[in-house]
Every structure is written in structure tokens, then in C-alpha cells.
């Protein structure tokens, strides 16, 4: 349904508040270095223009595409060349190439200062003084640091952020009320950003079909009572929403997401019995709730899959004539029966099934060739099951911090060329799989763990893509989306790696470590651990443990000393010498 003015259409659909918020997010995700005030000015100009188009859709420029309007606006930024360098060249291009160019310059690891949380009283004052600016600033700071954050979901986070301040700034103990809420929002926000980043990587690097396959599997697990045609419709709509958001079309994305939520709620009887509560909520909460809704119960007495996908005489004919439909049906039927499998495992099974049909269907006796295809699934299922079992046992034995350290050592030995901050960040996140998933019963462990690991490994992939240093990382990241985790798991110690030169400066610590939070102190120690492994990749677990124990004792001792700085200087030298001796450096 074509509209005379796209900008007027979206303004009317979304309302002024959401329109302004989404334009701010879009601009901050594109121009990540621009000051807040500049973005607010641009957003106000776009909003005023949109209002003129609402009043008269035939007004000048109102018929232009949103990409043209927004791109033209971004290209008016005076400091574009000096702030963004070659990104300014995008402005010389025509749409749609200009928007593609802006997308390519999105930076997953922008050089921005860490967000420091002010005192609670300072935040509450700022919130009361100018609530609108305070909330816009939140959108801006999150969007510029997370250029692929799912925009309609960020509106939901902003709503919760506002609610936290509204409630807690009136509380007797503001800090006790507010800080846990802000911590929760921060942690959920990081997780949400990472999950969306995987969706965008899936679409951008592996194409629409890969995303659709993921969506078929996930929605079939979630809505096992829904018919295949219903799941297919939801997949098509969901793909459109995420394609738009990942492509920077945030107004269309938010609008289409609202339409999808409306459709799901109007048709919940044929989708899932678990949607009732979600559908009673306001729009932003409703969409979030639907996205997180628990799996519905599996229909009773589902027939064996073998009848349609192995025993039927029409298997090859159906496959050859419409692979997407036939393999989609296979994936749907398998996924709805297996909420206990990860999505990536289901996709591996579907790929194995497809490969077998492709190999067998032209053979003299196709059925004999593919009759045992389901037997090929057994090792594919057992591999993640065994890996999760082993790692959960290790996690339960070590606890989160030491489990992270085990992963740090493991991954540094696999891909030592990767930067230390990236290895620390990724391994810490990989280690969180323990507390996140190992508490679950067997039936929920694999979907929790392996799908979470896919999200974390995608962080490694996008960070590595910016400055590639390891062929092994590139290979695991680009060859197959669903086999990334098995690919990294299969990597052994990189025997080609030339150990890093020893640099005492890397292992010199100061009294400031004593004032750090427990988390920051862990990161310092883990950074040192990665550097140790890079210097001595052949160091044994026992050697590394001894050095890390000595290091922990050294920090504890010096933080208790009267003259901390002297202690760190003198004891630090001794520690470095002892560590060198212990590791044979």
C-alpha cells in the first residue's frame, strides 16, 4: 500500500514521541561520534518537516523516501569529514548506495568513553530537571554504543528506565531502589544488543534464507500447535521486521513490529495458548513479552517424522520441486517435536537431511540411499549434549570466575592473535553460560547454552571482522553460521603462533586496582592471564594456576598495606621475577 508521503505515514502511525525517539536512535546508530546536542537538533528538524508533510502530503520533498530524507539530513553535518573520515564519501552516493555505505561504516566497537554512572542524587536531579532530555540522552548513549540495537526494543528499555527513575527518585533509599534496577537494565540491554547483532549478522552475512531457517526453527519450538502455514506467515513478517531494523529502516521496523504483535494477538487461538497475558499489555510490553514467551505445550500424538520424510515415495519429488517448502516443513516438524534441541542443532540436522537428499535423489534407488538418514543425526545431537555436560560439570566444580579463566586459557591458546580485550570480553561472556544455563534441567540446557554461545561467538566474529588478525577466526566465522560453535570447539592450540615478547609493563600494577569493583578487578586479573598465555602458550594449567594464585595473593596483600604504591612496586617486581621463573620465561 503506497503512501504519497512515507514520512507522514510513519509519523501518523507511530505518533510524535515514538517518531522522535526512533529518528534519534537511527541518527545515533549512524553517526556514533556526534555530540548529543547535534543529534537533537537534527531530530527536531526532521520532526518539524514530518509535521508539514502530515498537514499536506503534497508539500515539497514529502514524497521522498525516508533514506533520502534522513541521508540528506545526516550529510548536512559540518564536521562529517573530520569526525568520520571516509564515511563522508557516502554523501557523494545516490540512494540506495548511500544508505548501504552508512551501514558499512557502523562501528561495533566505537572509540567512546565508558559510561560512568553518576551518583544517584545527581541522576535524580537531572531526571526531575528535564525528564525529556534525560531520557533522550539514554537513547542516544545506548544507540551510539550499540549501532544494531533493536530500535523498538530500545523504546521498551527507555520506558523501563523512566519507570525506574519515577519510582526510585521518590523512595526513602533511592540507591537501594534504583541501582539494582539499573544493573538489571544494563545486563538485559547488553544481552538484547548481542542477540540482535546475531540476527543482523545472519541477515547481512548469510542472507534472508539463513535468517528464515532460524526463525522457522525457533517459532516452531515456541508455537508447536500452530500450523506450518501460520508459522510461515509469522516467519515472513518477522524477517521483514528484522531486515528493516538491521538495514537502518527503524520507523518501518517499529511500525511493522507493532502490526505483527497485533496480528499475533488477534490470532492467538491458532498460534499459542501462552500468549494471553502478553496480549493484555500495552504495545511495547506486548511486543517484548511475545518475543520472550515460553514454548507452548507440544500437541499430543504427533506422528513419526519418518512417514513423510523417509518412507514416502514422494520425498525426492517434493524436495526437488520446492526445496524451501519441503525443507521448511521438515524443520518445522522436527523443531516442534524438539524444544530440547538448540536452534543451531535443528538447522544442522536440516542441512544434513538436505545434503543427503541432494546426494541420493538422483541415484538408482533413492530410498535405499537415504533410508538411514535419521541415523546420521545421532552424532550431531550427542556432540553438543556431551560438550554441555562436560562444561556444566566444570562450571559446578570451579564457579563462574575460575570457569571463565579456564575458557580464557582455552580460547587464547586457540586464537592467540586476537586482541586481549576481545579475548577477555568474549571469554567472560562464554563463561556466563554456566550460571545462565547449567541450573536448567537437561531438557532446557541445550537450547539455552548453544543458542547463547552462538550469540557470544558472533560478538567475537563482528569484533574480529573490524580488524582481522586470525585466519582461523575468519574461517570459523564465515564458513557456516550454524557450525560456528563446533568450529571453534574443534580448534586445537595454534602451533604456528610465535609467543609474544615478555614486557614487564604488562604485569605492572598500581594501587588503583584496590578501589576497583570486584568485576573490574577480575577483568584486570583476566587480562594478565591472557597476556601470560600469549607469552607462554605451552604453559600448563598447573603453572598458570600457581602464577594466578600468587598474583591474587599479591593484590590482596598490597591492598591491605599502609603504603600501597610502594608495596605494588616492590612486591610486583618480585612477582614478575617469580612468575618468569615458574613459567620458564
Amino acid at each position: 500500500d503506497a503512501h504519497k508521503s512515507e514520512v507522514a505515514h510513519r509519523f501518523k502511525d507511530l505518533g510524535e514521541e515514538n517518531f522522535k525517539a526512533l529518528v534519534l536512535i537511527a541518527f545515533a546508530q549512524y553517526l556514533q561520534q556526534c555530540p548529543f546536542e547535534d543529534h537533537v537538533k537534527l531530530v527536531n528538524e526532521v520532526t518539524e518537516f514530518a509535521k508539514t508533510c502530515v498537514a499536506d502530503e503534497s508539500a515539497e520533498n514529502c514524497d521522498k523516501s525516508l533514506h533520502t530524507l534522513f541521508g540528506d539530513k545526516l550529510c548536512t553535518v559540518a564536521t562529517l569529514r573530520e569526525t568520520y573520515g571516509e564515511m563522508a564519501d557516502c554523501c557523494a552516493k545516490q540512494e540506495p548506495e548511500r544508505n548501504e555505505c552508512f551501514l558499512q561504516h557502523k562501528d561495533d566497537n566505537p572509540n567512546l568513553p565508558r559510561l560512568v554512572r553518576p551518583e544517584v542524587d545527581v541522576m535524580c536531579t537531572a531526571f526531575h530537571d528535564n525528564e525529556e532530555t534525560f531520557l533522550k540522552k539514554y537513547l542516544y548513549e545506548i544507540a551510539r554504543r550499540h549501532p544494531y540495537f533493536y530500535a523498538p526494543e530500545l523504546l521498551f528499555f527507555a520506558k523501563r528506565y523512566k519507570a525506574a527513575f519515577t519510582e526510585c527518585c521518590q523512595a526513602a533509599d533511592k540507591a537501594a531502589c534504583l541501582l539494582p534496577k539499573l544493573d538489571e537494565l544494563r545486563d538485559e540491554g547488553k544481552a538484547s544488543s548481542a542477540k540482535q547483532r546475531l540476527k543482523c549478522a545472519s541477515l547481512q552475512k548469510f542472507g534472508e534464507r539463513a535468517f528464515k531457517a532460524w526463525a522457522v526453527a525457533r517459532l516452531s519450538q515456541r508455537f508447536p500447535k500452530a500450523e506450518f502455514a501460520e508459522v510461515s506467515k509469522l516467519v515472513t513478517d518477522l524477517t521483514k521486521v528484522h531486515t528493516e531494523c538491521c538495514h537502518g529502516d527503524l520507523l518501518e521496523c517499529a511500525d511493522d513490529r507493532a502490526d505483527l504483535a497485533k496480528y499475533i494477538c488477534e490470532n492467538q487461538d491458532s498460534i499459542s495458548s501462552k500468549l494471553k497475558e502478553c496480549c493484555e499489555k500495552p504495545l511495547l510490553e506486548k511486543s517484548h513479552c511475545i518475543a520472550e514467551v515460553e514454548n507452548d505445550e507440544m500437541p499430543a500424538d504427533l506422528p513419526s517424522l519418518a512417514a513423510d520424510f523417509v518412507e514416502s515415495k514422494d520425498v525426492c519429488k517434493n524436495y526437488a520441486e520446492a526445496k524451501d517448502v519441503f525443507l521448511g516443513m521438515f524443520l518445522y516438524e522436527y523443531a516442534r517435536r524438539h524444544p530440547d534441541y538448540s536452534v543451531v542443532l535443528l538447522l544442522r540436522l536440516a542441512k544434513t537431511y538436505e545434503t543427503t537428499l541432494e546426494k541420493c535423489c538422483a541415484a538408482a534407488d533413492p530410498h535405499e540411499c537415504y533410508a538411514k538418514v535419521f541415523d546420521e543425526f545421532k552424532p550431531l545431537v550427542e556432540e553438543p549434549q556431551n560438550l554441555i555436560k562436560q562444561n556444566c560439570e566444570l562450571f559446578e566444580q570451579l564457579g563462574e570466575y575460575k570457569f571463565q579463566n579456564a575458557l580464557l586459557v582455552r580460547y587464547t591458546k586457540k586464537v592467540p592473535q586476537v586482541s586481549t580485550p576481545t579475548l577477555v570480553e568474549v571469554s567472560r561472556n562464554l563463561g556466563k553460560v554456566g550460571s545462565k544455563c547449567c541450573k536448567h534441567p537437561e531438557a532446557k540446557r541445550m537450547p539455552c547454552a548453544e543458542d547463547y554461545l552462538s550469540v557470544v561467538l558472533n560478538q567475537l566474529c563482528v569484533l574480529h571482522e573490524k580488524t582481522p588478525v586470525s585466519d582461523r577466526v575468519t574461517k570459523c566465522c564465515t564458513e557456516s553460521l550454524v557450525n560456528r560453535r563446533p568450529c571453534f570447539s574443534a580448534l586445537e592450540v595454534d602451533e604456528t603462533y610465535v609467543p609474544k615478547e615478555f614486557n614487564a609493563e604488562t604485569f605492572t600494577f598500581h594501587a588503583d586496582i584496590c578501589t576497583l569493583s570486584e568485576k573490574e578487578r577480575q577483568i584486570k586479573k583476566q587480562t594478565a592471564l591472557v597476556e601470560l598465555v600469549k607469552h607462554k602458550p605451552k604453559a600448563t594449567k598447573e603453572q598458570l594456576k600457581a602464577v594466578m594464585d600468587d598474583f591474587a595473593a599479591f593484590v590482596e596483600k598490597c591492598c591491605k598495606a599502609d603504603d600501597k604504591e610502594t608495596c605494588f612496586a616492590e612486591e610486583g617486581k618480585k612477582l614478575v621475577a617469580a612468575s618468569q621463573a615458574a613459567l620458564g620465561l
Partner: antibody
Framework: EVQLLESGGGLVQPGGSLRLSCAVS????????INWVRQAPGKGLEWIGI???????FYATWAKGRFTISRDNSKNTVYLQMNSLRAEDTAVYYC???????????????WGQGTLVTVSS | DIQMTQSPSSVSASVGDRVTITCQSS???????LSWYQQKPGKAPKLLIY???KLTSGVPSRFSGSGSGTDFTLTISSLQPEDFATYYC???????????FGGGTKVEIK
């Protein structure tokens, strides 16, 4: 040495029929999928259809109804029956084997030398 | 409707030149079901590359293929006298009935 050899081409009047043969030597045809591909003079390649080892056939949308592929494994030969021929069917017709291990992919590793079919009054 | 667009339709080049031929498909081909063929006048086509980037046995390493989804490229890194020919891409889709070839690219001597 594996060879595919097409025959049966020639001049045919519009509306007429023709049956082309593809004789295979050096391999047992019963294990392979064979395609028919044509090329109009000075033009590009156009896929007509395929017959799997099991005898199952598939055709390009435009070829359905007028063209039929069959095989006789005892003679190690595949056939292309063409009916209601038109001037635009004038082309060199090739048979080609699909790379073993693929069923629906456009990977044709062994080709005949082609046979010319001319449809003209 | 399936469209397989090859460009350029012809290219003049000298021995030793690097030649790049592109193939654009709409919709995207089925998981890298893309091949490249070489055809010389009066001869049958010869399969060079399958699965977008895999070289058929016996094909010189100066030939390489890349791409995925909708956009594919055949590159001849250093053109040899025997490489002057017409090149075709072939695509496989969700339905086998949609199997299609590109329009061809003639590589001529400059």
C-alpha cells in the same frame, strides 16, 4: 573413456515431432542423472530437463507438455521426445551428465558434442 | 520470474590481464548452487567451477569463483591464449524446474 553422443537431429517442419537420442559409453547409465540443454544459434544455453537414475523427470517450466525425457538403461541411452516443434526450437541440443552426488544442482561435468535441430518450412 | 544476469556481455582483454565476470541472480540461488562453464566455438560447454567457488579437477588455478546469494564472480587472474572463449554461469533454485544459465560473456582478444 566416458562419452555421450547425441543423434536424431535434422530438419523438421513446424508442428512436427522429433526424437533425439543420447547414447552413453564408458559408464553404466543406470547410476546417473542426464540433462538435456539446448543452444540456439549465436545464443546462450537453455536447460530443458533432467531424468534421474530412477527414471523421475523434471522439466523447465517452458518445456512442460511438449518435451518428454525417457531412458532405456539396457541400451545405455536417454531420449528427448519433442512435439509441436516451432521455429524458435531451432538449436543445438546437448545431453549432459549431472555430477555424481548432486541431484538438483546445475553441475554438468560430461557433455555430448550436440546435435542440430532445425525447425523450418 | 527467475533472472540470471551476466555482465559484461563481452570483454576485450590481452594475455596476462585479470578478467572479472559477474553473475547476478534474482531471486538468490539455492545455497550456492552456482556453476561456471567455458565454451569454445563449435564445442560443448566445460564445467569450470561448482558450488560458487570449487574448482573442477584439472581446471587451472588462475580460475576462481566467489560470491553467495545473488552476486557471484568468476575471475581469471592472468588470461592465457586458451582462455579466449564464452563463459556462462548456471544457477539452481528452490525448484529444479527453475535451473537457469546466464546470457554468457565473450572474452575476446584485444
Amino acid at each position: 573413456e566416458v562419452q555421450l553422443l547425441e543423434s536424431g537431429g535434422g530438419l523438421v517442419q513446424p508442428g512436427g515431432s522429433l526424437r533425439l537420442s543420447c547414447a552413453v559409453s564408458g559408464i553404466d547409465l543406470s547410476n546417473y542423472a542426464i540433462n538435456w540443454v539446448r543452444q540456439a544459434p549465436g545464443k546462450g544455453l537453455e536447460w530443458i530437463g533432467i531424468i534421474w537414475a530412477s527414471g523421475t523427470t523434471f522439466y523447465a517450466t517452458w518445456a512442460k507438455g511438449r518435451f518428454t525425457i525417457s531412458r532405456d538403461n539396457s541400451k545405455n541411452t536417454v531420449y528427448l521426445q519433442m512435439n509441436s516443434l516451432r521455429a524458435e526450437d531451432t538449436a543445438v541440443y546437448y545431453c549432459a551428465r549431472t555430477v555424481p552426488g548432486y541431484s538438483t544442482a546445475p553441475y554438468f561435468d560430461l557433455w555430448g558434442q550436440g546435435t542440430l535441430v532445425t525447425v523450418s518450412s | 520470474d527467475i533472472q540470471m544476469t551476466q555482465s559484461p556481455s563481452s570483454v576485450s582483454a590481452s594475455v596476462g590481464d585479470r578478467v572479472t565476470i559477474t553473475c547476478q541472480s534474482s531471486p538468490s540461488v539455492w545455497f550456492n548452487f552456482l556453476s561456471w562453464y567455458q565454451q569454445k566455438p563449435g564445442k560443448a560447454p566445460k564445467l569450470l567451477i561448482y558450488e560458487a567457488s570449487k574448482l573442477t579437477s584439472g581446471v587451472p588455478s588462475r580460475f576462481s569463483g566467489s560470491g553467495s546469494g545473488t552476486d557471484f564472480t568468476l575471475t581469471i587472474s592472468s588470461l592465457q591464449p586458451e582462455d579466449f572463449a564464452t563463459y556462462y554461469c548456471g544457477g539452481g533454485y528452490s525448484s529444479i524446474s527453475d535451473t537457469t544459465f546466464g546470457g554468457g560473456t565473450k572474452v575476446e582478444i584485444k
